[in-house]
């Protein structure tokens, strides 16, 4: 039996700059029941606070609701482990909510097969930013990627689309069914998960009244 090992805060994420969660790895428990607490202070303040919500984001986590989240302040966060034999603390982690945003995937992915005047066909991929993202006001600047592949293929073909929420893909195989997904990344944050797959079959012979 021994004091607990050093815990480690291994991830903090915000879906929208308005709330965030931090998760920790507990470290060894020293063979004894061990209690964990997350404490934090804010840039320029002496006061130390305890995690407002240990439940919402699951085990070994702390959820900061809107009431506790500010993008104007750096959070200095520590996890403390305590058992009968002693205690240990993680290294303090400095968290700027601007830099931990991982948004929800884009929505409304639509696929349309189109034809140019020269009879060349292409796939027109369109989508919308994630629901919570206030892109219009510049609160978020979002970049996007799409990926697609024939249904049976292993490898995805990835296209970076910048800030565009539509993209035209040329030179696809007639008669093939393609799977398409999209994802987004805010200017300083992390890529979202890939969206749910949409699929489209490229026609063998294409005639369109445009």
């Amino acid at each position: 039996q021994s004091p607990p090992g050093k815990p480690e805060i291994h991830k903090c994420r915000s879906p929208d700059k308005e709330t965030f969660t931090c998760w920790w790895n507990p470290g060894t428990d020293g063979g004894l029941p061990t209690n964990y607490s997350l404490t934090y202070s804010k840039e320029g303040e002496k006061t130390t606070y305890e995690c407002p919500d240990y439940k919402t984001s699951g085990p070994n986590s702390c959820f900061f609701s809107k009431q506790y989240t500010s993008i104007w302040k750096i959070y200095i966060i520590t996890v403390n482990a305590t058992n009968q034999m002693g205690s240990s603390s993680s290294d303090p982690l400095y968290v700027d909510v601007t830099y931990i945003v991982e948004p929800e995937p884009p929505r409304n992915l639509t696929l349309e097969v189109k034809q140019l005047k020269d009879k060349k066909t292409y796939l027109w991929v369109k989508w919308s930013p994630p629901t919570i993202t206030d892109v219009k006001t510049g609160w978020f600047t979002m970049e996007y990627e799409i990926r697609l592949k024939p249904e049976e293929a292993e490898e995805w073909e990835i296209h970076f689309t910048g800030h565009q929420t539509q993209f035209k893909v040329f030179d696809l195989y007639p008669g093939q069914k393609y799977l398409v997904q999209t994802r987004c990344k805010p200017d300083h944050g992390y890529w979202s998960r890939w969206s749910q797959e949409s699929s489209v079959e490229m026609p063998n012979d294409f005639t369109l009244k445009d």
Partner: antibody, heavy 118, light 112 residues
Framework: QVQLQQPGAELVRPGTSVKLSCKAS????????MHWVKQRPGQGLEWIGV????????NYNQKFKGKATLTVDTSSSTAYMQLSSLTSEDSAVYYC???????????WGQGTLVTVSA | DVVMTQTPLSLPVSLGDQASISCRSS???????????LHWYLQKPGQSPKLLIY???NRFSGVPDRFSGSGSGTDFTLKISRVEAEDLGVYFC?????????FGGGTKLEIK
């Protein structure tokens, strides 16, 4: 505790390439972005670029695009920077540096001195 | 790119004196989120740089309170109230509001 280990020095020929390593320990490697910084002898610091080890997303200083390539090996918790077409201008100390979830450098490697010489 | 200009280049001081280093940026350093990402690092001889001050005026963990930062917009200052021998080295200001992140040329604090 967090450590970033870099080899002390590399001597390389002009026109060749070199791949510098930065072995991370004491934290979850894929959780934090890794930056690279250049320091020429007796001069200031230049930010080269950053890589997110969780998905290998990179962002480069325009000045170093084509010169530096950042990669990671998550199985060994090691970040790499390859420098190509080396000239005497590339002779410098190169640091890897980790931020927290912030945009400054909290932890630094000891730096690798690259000397480009015929 | 944002150019960071530090003055003086060299600052000879006596131990116990106050030291002041200036840093001027070629663009305002207020980020779109309202924060000002101006930081100060100290590089001691033969070592890698260490963070002293983040976001203009916040001392990093373990940094003595004789170090203080101030400023706004494009003009920033680092002050050391009573210089100690362990403070000697090269001080760099750095901005991370605009990509690419850039550094000042450094100010060498040395004993008079």
């Amino acid at each position: 505790q967090v450590q970033l280990q870099q080899p002390g020095a590399e001597l390389v020929r002009p026109g060749t390439s070199v791949k510098l390593s930065c072995k991370a320990s004491g934290y979850t490697f894929t959780s934090f972005w890794m930056h690279w910084v250049k320091q020429r002898p007796g001069q200031g610091l230049e930010w080269i670029g950053v890589i997110d080890p969780s998905d290998t997303y990179t962002n480069y200083n325009q000045k170093f695009k084509g010169k530096a390539t950042l990669t990671v090996d998550t199985s060994s918790s090691t970040a790499y920077m390859q420098l190509s077409s080396l000239t005497s201008e590339d002779s410098a100390v190169y640091y890897c540096a980790r931020g927290d979830y912030s945009n400054w450098f909290t932890y630094w490697g000891q730096g690798t001195l690259v000397t480009v010489s015929a | 790119d944002v150019v960071m200009t530090q003055t003086p280049l060299s600052l000879p001081v006596s131990l116990g004196d106050q030291a002041s280093i200036s840093c001027r940026s070629s663009q305002r350093l207020v980020h779109s989120n309202g924060n000002t990402y101006l930081h100060w690092y100290l590089q001691k001889p033969g070592q890698s740089p260490k963070l002293l001050i983040y976001k203009v005026s916040n001392r990093f963990s373990g940094v003595p309170d004789r170090f203080s930062g101030s400023g706004s917009g494009t003009d920033f200052t680092l002050k050391i109230s009573r210089v100690e021998a362990e403070d000697l080295g090269v001080y760099f200001c750095s901005q991370s509001t605009h990509v690419p992140w850039t550094f000042g040329g450094g100010t060498k604090l040395e004993i008079k």
